[in-house]
């Protein structure tokens, strides 16, 4: 910017150097040059000379007026045309900014990723403000009444070491900039309820050579949480529609899940888990691609007529990605397909 120049006069802005976008703005230039009675005073915005809405108020002062100023940033300076000088003489310069007061932060969420040692809180900031906006995260113990505050730009990681005095907290976010301040709604947090299990990983997959070929997907997590509920979604790479199967998992050993899939097709699998009964999910794991083997015998392929040993009421739902670039954003289309598992074996296999 131009804030460090030596001025031979003054420049000021009404209503101020930071103002609400769309406001009418007046910028004044007052010269205090020695040995110069300026013929003209000129204004420049971002280095370009302005031609319109300039008023000479008196011998030393001029004003430029902008209707509905809507640029986030501009660098203003003014000069004097002094008799006998070939070049214009610099008087002063100012950085000006326009923007918006912050929206109240919304969708505040706090989670503890297992083994991270941090509580991570995120929120939606709302519409762009265009000016420096800070977020103050308030964390107040419901047991001791002590409050901690953390400055952030878009999210915050708070060491669980600083949250040892209590398990229950009230969390809210205050958005602050030069034009205003807004508070989010308060979030009640119990530290035991917001843990997200350690990342789940699909390690490998294989398709058997049985009469009815089945694909076994192997997946694991380093979580220490005993009761974990998981979803695995899968689809052919050419398809937009995901199928989702649900599992109760015990990660003391590698999980094996069976699928009866179309032959000679490339499938993508992803898994995510949460502590059973809690609301925060892991993000979906990295896509794992597996090619099923070619069909050996001739038979009519019916992907949903797999031979279950036991039917259960746990669901397989189908979801459709809104776009191939945003696989995380899903629309639930149906949830009517049954899930089953064989009678023997102690892992959650599904057909």
């Amino acid at each position: 910017g131009i804030t460090s120049i030596n001025c031979s006069g003054d420049m000021w802005v009404e209503p101020g150097e930071i103002f609400q976008m769309g406001m009418n703005v007046s910028i004044y230039c007052q010269e205090a040059l020695k040995h110069c009675r300026p013929r003209n005073l000129y204004f420049y915005k971002n280095g370009f000379k302005e031609e319109f809405d300039i008023t000479r108020i008196n011998r030393t002062t001029a004003r430029i007026w902008y209707k509905g100023f809507s640029e986030p940033h501009a660098y203003m300076h003014c000069t004097a045309e002094c008799p006998g000088h070939f070049q214009e003489t610099l008087i002063c310069g100012k950085d000006i900014s326009s923007g918006h007061p912050p929206d109240a932060p919304s969708n505040l969420t706090c989670v503890i990723y297992e083994y991270s040692g941090n509580m991570t809180c995120t929120w939606n900031t709302g519409k762009p403000t265009y000016i420096d906006t800070k977020y103050i995260v308030h964390v107040k113990s419901l047991e001791t009444e002590e409050e901690q505050q953390y400055l952030a730009s878009s999210y915050v990681k708070i060491s669980t070491d600083s949250l040892q005095g209590s398990r229950k907290y009230l969390v809210w976010v205050q958005a602050v900039n030069s034009l205003g301040m807004e508070n989010s709604q308060q979030l009640h947090v119990h530290l035991d309820d917001i843990v997200i299990p350690s990342a789940s990983i699909i390690s490998r997959a294989e398709t058997t050579n049985d009469t009815v070929p089945k694909t076994i997907v192997y997946w694991k997590s380093k979580t220490m949480i005993e009761k974990v509920f998981c979803e695995m979604r899968y689809k052919t790479t050419t398809n937009q529609t995901w199928s989702v199967k649900e599992f109760d998992a015990n990660f003391t050993y590698v999980q094996q899940s069976e699928f009866y899939l179309e032959p000679d097709s490339k499938y993508v699998f992803q898994v995510r888990c949460q502590e059973t009964g809690k609301r925060n999910w892991q993000p979906w794991s990295s896509p794992f691609v597996h090619q099923t083997s070619q069909e050996t015998g001739k038979r009519n392929w019916q992907p949903w007529s797999s031979p279950f040993v036991h039917q259960t009421s746990q669901t397989v739902s189908q979801v459709t990605a809104k776009s191939s670039h945003e696989p995380q954003k899903m629309e639930m289309l149906s949830a009517t397909i049954f899930r089953g598992h064989p009678a023997s074996g102690n892992h959650q296999d599904i057909g």
Partner: nanobody
Framework: QVQLQESGGGLVQPGGSLRLSCATS????????MRWVRQAPGKGLEWVSG???????IYADSVKGRFTISKDNAKNTLYLQLNSLKTEDTAMYYC??????????GSQGTQVTVSS
């Protein structure tokens, strides 16, 4: 109970510097967020700057680039370095708990006067 004691004010010429201190006791300073506020003669309280427990800082536009807030957890002390002082910085300066807000909790403050 919480105690805050400001010091370091004085008379200084425009363009000069000062360092204000705020000695604290009665709470866990290393976990505390702190702020400075000021009150110019005949005016209301004005928030100046804040710092959280990890050292992240925030400043009022009027002092940005000239003032620096910091804290020393070993000494339980909050600081405000004032550089390039202007006559409009003349005020009583107070420290308080919390990053942001134009209130203080009744400490006695320290006077800063900028005059040529």
């Amino acid at each position: 109970q919480v105690q805050l004691q400001e010091s370091g004010g004085g008379l200084v010429q425009p363009g000069g510097s000062l360092r204000l201190s705020c000695a604290t006791s009665g709470f866990t300073f290393r976990l505390a967020a702190m702020r400075w506020v000021r009150q110019a003669p005949g005016k209301g309280l004005e928030w100046v700057s804040g710092i959280d427990s990890r050292g992240s800082t925030i400043y009022a536009d009027s002092v940005k680039g000239r003032f620096t807030i910091s804290k020393d957890n070993a000494k339980n002390t909050l600081y405000l370095q004032l550089n390039s002082l202007k006559t409009e910085d003349t005020a009583m300066y107070y420290c308080a708990q919390g990053v942001y807000g134009d209130t203080y909790s009744g400490s006695q403050g320290t006077q800063v006067t900028v005059s040529s």
